[in-house]
């Protein structure tokens, strides 16, 4: 339905608070280096303009598209050329090319300082002094560091952030109340950002067919009692929502997400028995709850799939007449029967089924050709099952830190050209799969583990795309979305890699090591481990373990010393020499 003024339409639908929050997020995700005050000024100008359009939709410029209005506003920033370089060239373009240009310049790894958390009293004072500015600052800081963060979900995080301060700044022990809540929000926020980044990559790099296939599989697992037609409708709507958010159309995205939540709550009976408690909540909470809702129970006595997808005389007719719908039905039927499979595995099975039909429906005897198609699924199912089993055993044996180290070594050997910070970040996150998934019952392990790994590997792909250094990474990232994880799993030691020259500076440590948090210490040690493997890619596990044990002992010794810096200066070169000898 068309509106005379798009900006007025969205302002009325969303309300002033959400409108302003979303515009701030949009601007912060586009211009990630701009100071907070500059963005607030731009948002206020846009909001005042929107209000004039609400009052009179025929007023000047009110008929312009949101991209035109927002792009024009971004292009008024005085320091665009100095701060962003070639991104300023976007402003010479017309819509829709200008918006595409801004999107292409979003930086997944912006050069921004890590956020430092002030003292609790300082934060509480800031919160009480100016709550609105405090919350805007949160939106701004998260959005500029996570340029693909799911905007309506970020509003939900901001609401929780506000609630945490409102509650804890009144508590007797403010820190004990607030810090765990902030830690939880930080960790959940990072996870939410990474999950959304995969959705956007799926849409932008592989197209909406890939995203729709993912959504069919996931929603069929969640809503196994819903009919295919219902799942298809939800998939279409969800695809529109994520296409909009990933494309920077945050107002439309938030509005459509609210409509989807409304539809789901009005049609619970034909979707899932699990939606009830979500639907009693206010909008932001409701949408979040619906997105995270647990799988409904599978209907009893679901018939075998073979009758319709293997034995039927009409398999090739269905494939020829309506390929995507037929494959979608197959995926729906398989997924609703298998909440114990990862979405990526289900998509591989659908791909294998499609490949078989593509080949067999052109054969002399199609039925004879595809009769054993389900047997071909067995190795595809067993591969992730075995991988999860082996890695969970390793995790239980080693614990998280050492499991991360095993993965650091494994991945550095596979792709040693990748930058050390990226290898450390990605391997640490890959290692978190253990604590997250291995404690779960068998039926939940694979979906938890493999779908989480897909999210983490997407981070590697996104960072690598910015500065490509490895053909193997490019190949695994671009050939097939569903086979990314098996592709990385299959990589072996890179024989063509020329070991990195030894640099003593890389292995020189100082007394500041002692004041670091446990996490920061781990990162330092893991950085050294990656550098070690890059220097000696053929080093054995035993050799590396020996060096790392010596490193831990050396750091512990010097951190206990009276003159820590002197200890590091004296013991450091000894450690380096001993390490070189051990790895010779």
């Amino acid at each position: 339905d068309t509106h005379k003024s798009e900006v007025a339409h969205r302002f009325k639908d969303l309300g002033e608070e959400h409108f302003k929050g979303l515009v701030l997020v949009a601007f912060s995700q586009y211009l990630q280096q701009c100071p907070f005050e500059e963005h607030v000024k731009l948002v206020n100008e846009v909001t005042e303009f929107a209000k004039t359009c609400v009052a009179d939709e025929s007023a000047e410029n009110c008929d312009k598209s949101l991209h035109t209005l927002f792009g024009d506003k971004l292009c008024t920033v005085a320091t665009l050329r100095e701060t962003y370089g070639e991104m300023a060239d976007c402003c010479a373009k017309q819509e829709p090319e200008r918006n595409e240009c801004f999107l292409q310049h979003k930086d997944d790894n912006p050069n921004l300082p890590p956020l430092v958390r002030p003292e609790v009293d300082v934060m509480c004072t800031a919160f009480h002094d100016n709550e609105a500015t405090f919350l805007k600052k949160y939106l701004y800081e998260v959005a500029r560091r996570h340029p693909y963060f799911y905007a309506p979900e970020l509003l939900f995080f901001a609401a929780r952030y506000k609630a945490a301060f409102a509650e804890c700044c009144q508590a007797a022990d403010k820190a004990a109340c607030l810090l765990p809540k902030l830690d939880e929000l930080r960790d959940e926020g990072k996870a939410s950002s990474a999950k959304q980044r995969l959705k956007c990559a799926s849409l932008q790099k592989f197209g909406d067919r890939a995203f729709k296939a993912w959504a069919v599989a996931r929603l069929s697992q969640k809503f196994p009692k819903a009919e295919f037609a219902e799942v298809s409708k939800l998939v279409t709507d969800l695809t529109k929502v994520h296409t909009e958010c990933c494309h920077g159309d945050l107002l439309e995205c938030a509005d459509d997400r609210a409509d989807l939540a409304k539809y789901m709550c009005e049609n619970q009976d034909s979707i899932s028995s699990k939606l009830k408690e979500c639907c009693d909540k206010p909008l932001l909470e409701k949408s979040h709850c619906l997105a995270e809702v647990e799988n409904d129970e599978m209907p009893a006595d679901l018939p075998s799939l073979a009758a319709d997808y293997v034995e039927s005389k009409d398999v090739c007719k269905n494939y020829a007449e309506a390929k995507d719908v037929f494959l979608g039905m197959f995926l729906y039927e398989y997924a609703r029967r298998h909440p114990d499979y990862s979405v990526m595995l289900l998509l591989r099975l659908a791909k294998a089924y499609e490949a078989t039909l593509e080949k067999c429906c052109a054969a002399a005897d199609p039925h004879e050709c595809y009769a054993k198609v389900f047997d071909e699924f067995q190795p595809l199912v067993e591969e992730p099952q075995n991988l999860v089993k082996q890695n969970c055993e390793l995790f239980e044996q080693l614990g998280e830190y050492k499991f991360q180290n095993a993965l650091l070594v494994r991945y550095t050997k596979k792709v040693p050209q990748v930058s050390t910070p990226t290898l450390v970040e990605v391997s640490r996150n890959l290692g978190k799969v253990g604590a997250k998934c291995c404690k779960l019952p068998e039926a939940k392990r694979m979906p938890c583990a493999e779908d989480y790994l897909s999210v983490v590997l997407n981070r590697l792909c996104v960072l690598h795309e910015k500065t490509p250094v490895s053909e193997k990474v490019t190949k695994c990232c671009t050939e097939s979305l569903v086979n990314r994880r098996p592709c990385f799993s299959a990589l072996e030691l890179d024989e063509a890699y020329v070991p990195k020259a030894f640099n003593a500076e890389t292995f020189t440590f100082h007394a500041d090591m002692c004041t670091l948090s446990e996490k920061e210490k781990q990162v330092k040690k893991q950085t050294a481990l990656v550098e070690l493997v890059k220097h000696k890619p053929k080093a054995t596990k035993e050799q590396l373990k020996g060096v790392m044990d010596n490193f831990a002992a050396f750091v512990e010794k010097c951190c206990k010393a009276d003159d820590k810096e002197a200890c590091f200066a004296e013991e450091g070169p000894k450690f380096v020499a001993a390490s070189q000898a051990a790895l010779a």
Epitope: E227, F228, S232, P303, S312, D314, E321, A322, M329
Partner: nanobody, 123 residues
Framework: QVQLVESGGGLVKPGGSLRLSCAAS????????AAWFRQAPGKEREFVSA???????TYADSVKGRFTISRDNAKNSLYLQMNSLRAEDTAVYYC?????????????????WGQGTLVTVSS
């Protein structure tokens, strides 16, 4: 296997209405194409109406605007609402189903059939 049982036939005056039902058992048929065919005495069986998984309906020209096909997947049932009945609508009405994404109009494309229910339109 799918079993189909029709009901709702009977004697009705011209201009009157009837609603035929077809209950499916054996397996859910929400993704199946389903159709109504009819056979008048001494004539070939002919297509009346079909509906696909999306509930998109097609009709024979002779019944367009008078008959409405529908399905209730929760009840695993198919219906045919017949209004403004004419003498030439007299026939045995058969319900049919097949696992097809696009609903066919040809009787030979359907795998499962009911026994039929007689509809007589007469004053």
């Amino acid at each position: 296997q799918v079993q189909l049982v029709e009901s709702g036939g009977g004697l009705v005056k011209p201009g009157g209405s009837l609603r035929l039902s077809c209950a499916a058992s054996g397996r859910p048929v929400s993704n199946y194409a389903a159709a109504w065919f009819r056979q008048a005495p001494g004539k070939e069986r002919e297509f009346v109406s079909a509906i696909n998984w999306q509930k998109t309906a097609t009709y024979a020209d002779s019944v367009k605007g008078r008959f409405t096909i529908s399905r209730d997947n929760a009840k695993n049932s198919l219906y045919l609402q017949m209004n403004s009945l004419r003498a030439e609508d007299t026939a045995v009405y058969y319900c049919a189903a097949v696992f097809r994404v696009v609903a066919p109009k040809t009787q030979y494309d359907y795998d499962y059939w009911g026994q039929g229910t007689l509809v007589t339109v007469s004053s």
